[in-house]
């Protein structure tokens, strides 16, 4: 008998090299392959349960960034004034979540911020869990 | 056929709005669909491997906090005089391990700590592993 | 009918106590049961798909570190004249990946940099993706 | 609006010394890294310099190493390049301009200075 | 170290595409970004990661890459096009790496 495979995890790798002010980051899936889709800049959220989540990224301009899941609810990241970012995170998200960037800039003299290295990476921990597509 | 489904990821988060100065954090799991559980103010560690580990919280005074799994083995986590935690980590823990705080104050003033956003986060790593319940 | 099981994670924890300028970190891996391997002191990549990547110790002096998984692209972690680390990564390896170190010494008096707890942990994400072996 | 402004470029004999000043202003200078970019009389541009931004690491283009030495006024919001044993072949405009840091894994220069000429000459 | 070859010069009428190439060693597998710089001035930015475009730069100016060479193209060049270009890669021996540099002319 041929011993059980893992059906596949959901995880994807997200990347951006652009974000607008009072916007987001406009993000694109570089592989074809990935168990997780964007749709309207942001990464649709299908399984229940907890994400590892790591966000890396160099800015061209200062600026303040948050990570969101869910309309009313807090960041899963906020940082204020940065220029870079490099952090992981962990956190439970549910079907119907979606996560998406929200910027401001602290200078009225561009609108655009070029992003050397910017990647988002959500990988779902709870494989087995509810998941709705 | 049914492809093979994934048993369930042993995991939990477990919150905590209060510490005891010399004593821990009061931890309660808000879901009784956990797969780890909570006894004595611990998370009891019934499955071999390394587990995720993501501790968060902003304290109402200033403290000492370490998060232990064995006696006699050093912490997994240790901050000292902070206000407040982000911390993750990742750590091999077996069967019969136990993960709970200790929490020291440097002020005379008060016994009680309180814990704004306190949560912590366990997620098992090697599924397949040994397991004991 | 018995529920399937996990088949197991590839995962290792290497440990080095001591490290060469010029050169890298002498890795060792403490148990036998690990399901990935060291070869001429780097840690083999046969599975693709993300890692948990955790990276921790205290160094005798100070010292530049950069973990690499493959010539010609950049570090998985990058630090500058440092005298610890405690870090945690996700990053996306392959087949054929490598992960090895590069250590700079900032001084002409010595060669050898003693670590104490030394620890670099791989834990693979993606199981049920391509592995070769 | 971001400036960056060079000075400081001369005429010197071979052998000689000068330093460069980039005086930087728009944005918060002390959270940017920053380099120097030459270009010889009729040729292409060349990398020779980068400071992190706090001015705790350094880098240098092989042709300069030894010779030339970058750094940085936080409080002062000023690039210096500071050369010594200059050489006829040193003989450029040298630009500021700023980066992302080099542990990035990737990197480009999106802010540039309007130059400042050094000549080196007997 | 790294090398990337540039033609010296290029000419192109009046708004008709000017192609210009940047080849290099497997350089698909790299980023590359592309500077303009007119006589007399400082460089500008146009392109970074091979194909995105700064805020400012018309939407003219596109670039591509894939295996050996990275192109960029302006799709209609103007007469304020006529400049040198530059393209540049990131080496993690060699750090900045430019281009020779092309000349448009625009005729």
């Known amino acids: 008998q041929v011993p059980p495979q893992y059906p596949p995890i959901q995880s994807i790798r997200v990347q951006f090299t652009r974000c607008e002010n009072e916007k987001g980051c406009i993000i694109t899936s570089p592989s074809k392959d990935e168990t997780m889709k964007v749709q309207d800049n942001s990464i649709i959220i299908n399984c229940d349960g907890f994400y590892l989540i790591s966000l890396k990224g160099y800015f061209s301009e200062e600026l303040s960034l948050s990570l969101y899941y869910r309309k009313g609810r807090g960041p899963l990241f906020s940082l204020s004034k940065v220029t870079s970012v490099d952090s992981i995170g962990v956190a439970y998200l549910a079907f119907k979540d979606k996560v998406y960037f929200n910027v401001t800039t602290h200078s009225t003299s561009y609108k655009d911020i070029q992003v050397n290295g910017g990647e988002l990476i959500l990988i779902h921990q709870n494989p087995g869990g509810f998941c709705a597509y | 056929q049914v492809p093979p489904q994934y048993p369930p990821i042993q995991s939990i988060r477990v919150q905590f709005t209060r510490c005891e100065n010399e004593k821990g954090c009061i931890i309660t799991s808000p879901s009784k669909d956990e797969t780890m559980k909570v006894q004595d103010n611990s998370i009891i560690i019934n499955c071999d491997g390394f587990y995720l580990i993501s501790l968060k919280g902003y304290f109402s005074e200033e403290l000492s906090l370490s998060l232990y799994y064995r006696k006699g083995r050093g912490p997994l986590f240790s901050l000292s005089k902070v206000t407040s935690v982000d911390s993750i980590g990742v750590a091999y823990l077996a069967f019969k391990d136990k993960v709970y705080f200790n929490v020291t104050t440097h002020s005379t003033s008060y016994k009680d700590i309180q814990v704004n956003g306190g949560e912590l986060i366990l997620i098992h790593q090697n599924p397949g592993g040994f397991c004991a319940y | 009918q018995v529920p399937p099981q996990y088949p197991p994670i590839q995962s290792i924890r290497v440990q080095f106590t001591r490290c060469e300028n010029e050169k890298g970190c002498i890795i060792t891996s403490p148990s036998k049961d690990e399901t990935m391997k060291v070869q001429d002191n780097s840690i083999i990549i046969n599975c693709d798909g993300f890692y948990l990547i955790s990276l921790k110790g205290y160094f005798s002096e100070e010292l530049s570190l950069s973990l690499y998984y493959r010539k010609g692209r950049g570090p998985l972690f990058s630090l500058s004249k440092v005298t610890s680390v405690d870090s945690i990564g996700v990053a996306y390896l392959a087949f054929k990946d490598k992960v090895y170190f590069n250590v700079t010494t900032h001084s002409t008096s010595y060669k050898d940099i003693q670590v104490n707890g030394g620890e670099l942990i791989l834990i693979h994400q993606n199981p049920g993706g391509f592995c070769a072996y | 609006e971001v400036q960056l402004v060079e000075s400081g470029g001369d005429l010197v004999k071979p052998g000689g010394s000068l330093r460069l000043s980039c005086v930087a202003s728009?944005?918060?200078?002390?959270?940017?890294?920053m380099s120097w970019v030459r270009q010889a009389p009729g040729k292409g541009l060349q990398w020779v310099a980068y400071?992190?931004?706090?001015?705790?690491?350094?880098s240098y283009a092989d042709v300069v190493k030894g010779r030339f030495t970058i750094s940085r006024d936080n409080a002062k919001n000023t690039l210096y390049l500071q050369m010594n044993s200059l050489r006829a072949d040193d003989t450029a405009v040298y630009y500021c301009?700023?980066?992302?840091?080099?542990?990035?894994?990737?990197?480009?220069?999106?802010?540039w200075g309007q130059g400042t000429l050094v000549t080196v000459s007997s | 170290s790294y090398v990337l070859t540039q033609l010296p010069s290029k000419n192109v009428t009046l708004k008709q595409a000017a192609h210009i190439t940047c080849g290099g060693d497997?350089?698909?597998?790299?980023?590359v970004h592309w500077y303009q710089q007119k006589l007399g001035q400082a460089p500008v930015l146009i392109i970074y990661?091979?194909?995105s475009r700064p805020t400012g730069i018309p939407e003219r100016f596109s670039g591509a890459n894939s295996g050996n060479t990275a192109t960029l193209t302006i799709s209609g060049a103007l007469a304020e096009d006529e400049a040198d270009y530059y393209c540049?890669?990131?080496?993690?021996?060699?750090?900045?790496?430019f281009g020779e540099g092309t000349q448009l002319t625009v005729l």
């Open positions: 301009a700023r980066t992302f840091p080099t542990v990035a894994t990737d990197n480009w220069f999106y802010y």
């Open positions: 728009g944005f918060t200078f002390s959270s940017f890294p």
């Open positions: 400071i992190n931004s706090g001015g705790s690491s350094t």
């Open positions: 497997n350089i698909g597998s790299k980023s």
């Open positions: 990661y091979d194909s």
């Open positions: 540049q890669v990131w080496d993690s021996s060699a750090k900045w790496v």
